[in-house]
Amino acid sequence: RAVPGGSSPAWTQCQQLSQKLCTLAWSAHPLVGHMDLREEGDEETTNDVPHIQCGDGCDPQGLRDNSQFCLQRIHQGLIFYEKLLGSDIFTGEPSLLPDSPVGQLHASLLGLSQLLQPEGHHWETQQIPSLSPSQPWQRLLLRFKILRSLQAFVAVAARVFAHGAATLSP
């Protein structure tokens, strides 16, 4: 586990779990139900879900200087997606396929967020908006877009942890 006061997390463990997350996110995506691509709309990105951006300190230099900024951002994102995957968007009808990896994905998000959360120390969780109720007709598109955003998020997180494991591990 990461330790309060800015010490390093268990980079190798984080790397392994984030790689597992990548695999799960990609395998979950086609299984959320048939999605007509015309339903996607034009917007490629949305403010409804977290993204890792340039100013978040997740570049090699930023990680070297102070990895806590980036790790906090990743932690916030993991908590956000964990909340989304546990909401009625994914748990309500139309039901997911019985073999859907969304349950595993949900558990792995929680696992990685706990690995990053220092004992006895709580990062400020940037306002995670309360989720509005969704109706079944909305859910296929919501699932599709959330998982697509999650894929991008965990891909960046995995690169961060791979870099950390290779260059920042004690």
Partner: antibody, heavy 117, light 107 residues
Framework: EVQLLESGGGLVQPGGSLRLSCAAS????????MTWVRQAPGKGLEWVSG????????WYADSVKGRFTISRDNSKNTLYLQMNSLRAEDTAVYYC??????????WGQGTMVTVSS | DIQMTQSPSSLSASVGDRVTITCRAS??????LHWYQQKPGKAPNLLIF???NLHSGVPSRFSGSRSGTDFTLTISSLQPEDFATYFC?????????FGHGTRLEIK
């Protein structure tokens, strides 16, 4: 009192544009998805478009896809429908409605859009 | 798209009558069927949601039920204010679709 109030309807020529607004009051607008439903004169109800609470996710009926754009400004408690390339068959009363937990639970009074040359 | 077939399209009845309106979905929609009432020149109002639940303020003479993909709206004893048009709607899949309506008139 929970209320939705549409505005912006009127007479427009085929191919023209119009922007409808729906002002919400009496509830936490940013916590709800919203939708537009229309009703042609003497006809039934037709769902047009929907938008998720914070605006990043949108849905459209095939009949309006590529021509209409739904948006919202949560700071102003207002829902919008930008309608381009209007056709005679878009003539209808347009209602905004709140997407409740189960159904469209609150409706505005409607605004009439007439597309005619 | 899921088609909602509503019947009858119009109905004449008297105050005090028991009236039933039916709606059939072209495929399974679970219990995601709702009923709205609309009076001339006014917006629709939600009456019943999720098959059988009365929206707030709706009198108990209104009720809803389901058998498979067939849904029924029943008014146990018609009152003068109940003469209106009634629509069913499914919220199970995109796009949400409505029945064509049942116009309830005074006999």
């Amino acid at each position: 009192e929970v209320q939705l109030l549409e505005s912006g309807g009127g007479l427009v020529q085929p191919g023209g544009s119009l922007r409808l607004s729906c002002a919400a009051s009496g509830f936490t607008f940013s916590a709800y998805s919203m939708t537009w439903v229309r009703q042609a004169p003497g006809k039934g109800l037709e769902w047009v478009s929907g938008i998720y609470s914070s605006g990043g996710f949108t849905w459209y009926a095939d009949s309006v896809k590529g021509r209409f754009t739904i948006s919202r400004d949560n700071s102003k408690n207002t829902l919008y429908l930008q309608m381009n390339s209007l056709r005679a068959e878009d003539t209808a009363v347009y209602y905004c409605a709140r997407v409740g937990l189960w159904a469209f639970d609150i409706w505005g009074q409607g605004t009439m859009v007439t597309v005619s040359s | 798209d899921i088609q909602m077939t509503q019947s009858p399209s119009s109905l004449s009845a008297s105050v005090g009558d028991r009236v039933t309106i039916t709606c059939r979905a072209s495929q399974s929609i679970s219990g995601y069927l709702h009923w709205y009432q609309q009076k001339p020149g006014k917006a629709p109002n939600l009456l019943i949601f999720a098959t059988s639940n009365l929206h707030s303020g709706v009198p108990s003479r209104f009720s809803g039920s389901r058998s498979g993909t067939d849904f029924t709206l029943t008014i146990s004893s018609l009152q003068p204010e109940d003469f209106a048009t009634y629509f069913c709607q499914q919220s199970f899949s995109t796009p949400p679709t409505f029945g064509h309506g049942t116009r309830l008139e005074i006999k």
